[in-house]
């Protein structure tokens, strides 16, 4: 069985042959303020092996194609503004360019 936060992408009858991170974020992780570029923001990186980078929810539910892969799954979103954070420590992101 895949760990929590993972999904079985290829499975045999009674076992999973390949687990990948579940590619859809929980709803509460998706709502990021649109004005965040105007101030310094600190993001908590998700624990490794849990959820992937999350994209804002598309307004009309059917987003145009995207070419950025998440593991072996691909995401469609109107706004691909996610910032991959490879560590589990908080990372301060500044929009001032300094």
């Amino acid at each position: 069985e895949c760990r929590p936060g993972m999904i079985c992408a290829t499975s045999a009858t009674n076992s999973c042959a390949r687990c990948v991170p579940y590619p859809i974020c929980a709803a509460e992780t998706v709502t990021k303020p649109q004005d965040m570029a105007e101030k310094d923001t600190t993001f908590e990186a998700p624990p490794l092996g849990t959820q992937p980078d999350c994209n804002p929810t598309p307004e009309n539910g059917e987003a145009p194609a995207s070419t950025s892969p998440t593991q072996s799954l691909l995401v469609d979103s109107q706004a691909s503004k996610t910032l991959p954070i490879p560590t589990s420590a908080p990372v301060a992101l500044s929009s001032t360019g300094k």
């Epitope: 499975s11 076992s15 859809i24 598309p58 469609d76």
Partner: nanobody, 122 residues
């Protein structure tokens, strides 16, 4: 209890299109994330696409740009539009509810509905 019925499969020539439907009953709200899986003859069960309750969509590499998933929450129905079909898309297609919870282990093909056969052949 959640029950699913898949439909819309058939025999189609390479390059053709189909629209699969998955009608659900037993949900108490707009429904959870929904996934489409498929199993080709003699192969393992393979994740194809997922759609969230609010319409965010995800596809596996092999169908990206050819398949489109959508949902009609009012009718408790999820659709999978299959375009530019190729012989390797031949499989039984199944939908699965709440794959985050239900598709972590074992086989996610055929647990909730009978599936619908898609055959791509000239």
């Amino acid at each position: 209890e959640v029950q699913l019925v898949e439909s819309g499969g058939g025999l189609v020539q390479p390059g053709g299109s189909l629209r699969l439907s998955c009608t659900a009953s037993g949900f108490t709200d707009d429904g959870p994330d929904m996934a489409w899986y498929r199993r080709a003859p003699g192969n393992e069960c393979e994740l194809v696409s997922i759609i969230s309750a609010d319409g965010r969509t995800y596809y596996t590499d092999s169908v990206k740009g050819r398949f489109t998933i959508s949902r009609d929450n009012a009718k408790n129905t999820v659709f999978l539009y299959l375009n530019s079909l190729q012989p390797e898309d031949t499989a039984v297609y199944y939908c699965a509810p709440d794959p985050r919870r239900n598709c972590r282990g074992g086989d996610c093909c055929g647990n909730w509905g009978p599936g619908t056969q898609v055959t791509v052949s000239s």
